[in-house]
Amino acid sequence: HNTTVFQGVAGQSLQVSCPYDSMKHWGRRKAWCRQLGEKGPCQRVVSTHNLWLLSFLRRWNGSTAITDDTLGGTLTITLRNLQPHDAGLYQCQSLHGSEADTLRKVLVEVLADPLDHRDAGDLWFPGESESFEDAHVEHSISRSLLEGEIPFPPTS
């Protein structure tokens, strides 16, 4: 599997999408897990509804949500209030029994908030009728790792 990079800004939400063949994975629950080290296990973060027919319902675990469009074949994971410690390698998985198929390997990169170090005078504030919540735009940039790139830095 190639690794796809998704970049998000600290403090904002990042949406990760994992496309798959809906018939190949028909009846399969899905999961989002975090890779622990280059060869370590993938630790489950959140999985779709126990009833596959209800997979479209968004399920949360802390600040991470998952929802599955089982007909369209797209698994969507939302990382809310992205933090530097969220950076790392993840997997979208399709589950059957005790087995898990990798749908996509994902490298999450967290960019510093460009507004963090500005003077208050430089900030734009939404109008009175709006709130920061309303003005929020989810930010997601994705790319595939280039050949030779490694998702984990070499350990000394």
Epitope: D21, M23, K24, W26, G27, L51, H96, G97, S98
Partner: antibody, heavy 121, light 107 residues
Framework: EVQLVQSGAEVKKPGESLKISCKGS????????IGWVRQMPGKGLEWMGI????????RYSPSFQGQVTISADKSISTAYLQWSSLKASDTAMYFC??????????????WGQGTLVTVSS | EIVMTQSPATLSVSPGERATLSCRAS??????LAWFQQKPGQAPRLLIY???TRATGIPARFSGSGSGTEFTLTISSLQPEDFAVYYC?????????FGQGTKVDIK
Amino acid sequence: EVQLVQSGAEVKKPGESLKISCKGSGYSFTSYWIGWVRQMPGKGLEWMGIIYPGDADARYSPSFQGQVTISADKSISTAYLQWSSLKASDTAMYFCARRRQGIFGDALDFWGQGTLVTVSS
Amino acid sequence: EIVMTQSPATLSVSPGERATLSCRASQSVSSNLAWFQQKPGQAPRLLIYGASTRATGIPARFSGSGSGTEFTLTISSLQPEDFAVYYCLQDNNFPPTFGQGTKVDIK
């Protein structure tokens, strides 16, 4: 009507190659996994491996990994099981079966009639 | 690899009687278990999947139960056409594995 039709019986010599087929009809061939099952003379069923014709993703039981190759040609709705060098111990009946996935469990719901492979010098 | 053990190896039953076949897994397979019937010279036929769901066209006299490691196939009243070999198959863990079979013959 869903049907899986397998190629005819084969008699081969040890060391020869062989490719048997399983043609699906009456359903969307690319949307269901096709499995292969071996039954040696007078013995039980053994799960060999499976392929998803939609993207040619093949999985093998460790017992058969490296011994056989499973492939598919979606343009003619046909799955294949092949050997590059047959052994006498490959003598068996080989079945293909369609795997249907669902919320109540998976099922090998339709089976081919079987292909008898005899390997003898 | 999960080992599926079927018992008894042979079951002798009179027509009209009840037959109970057992399948035990070496570790839990949840409810990912199917039962097949095979007659001489024929391909296997799916009877039960998901441990207890009857396949399309299968008579109500066939029923499956169990979960985890212990499973049962019950034929409530054996008909002449039911004398055959029965196999269980787990596909909870890769690779899927069959039991060695139970032959149901006429007493």
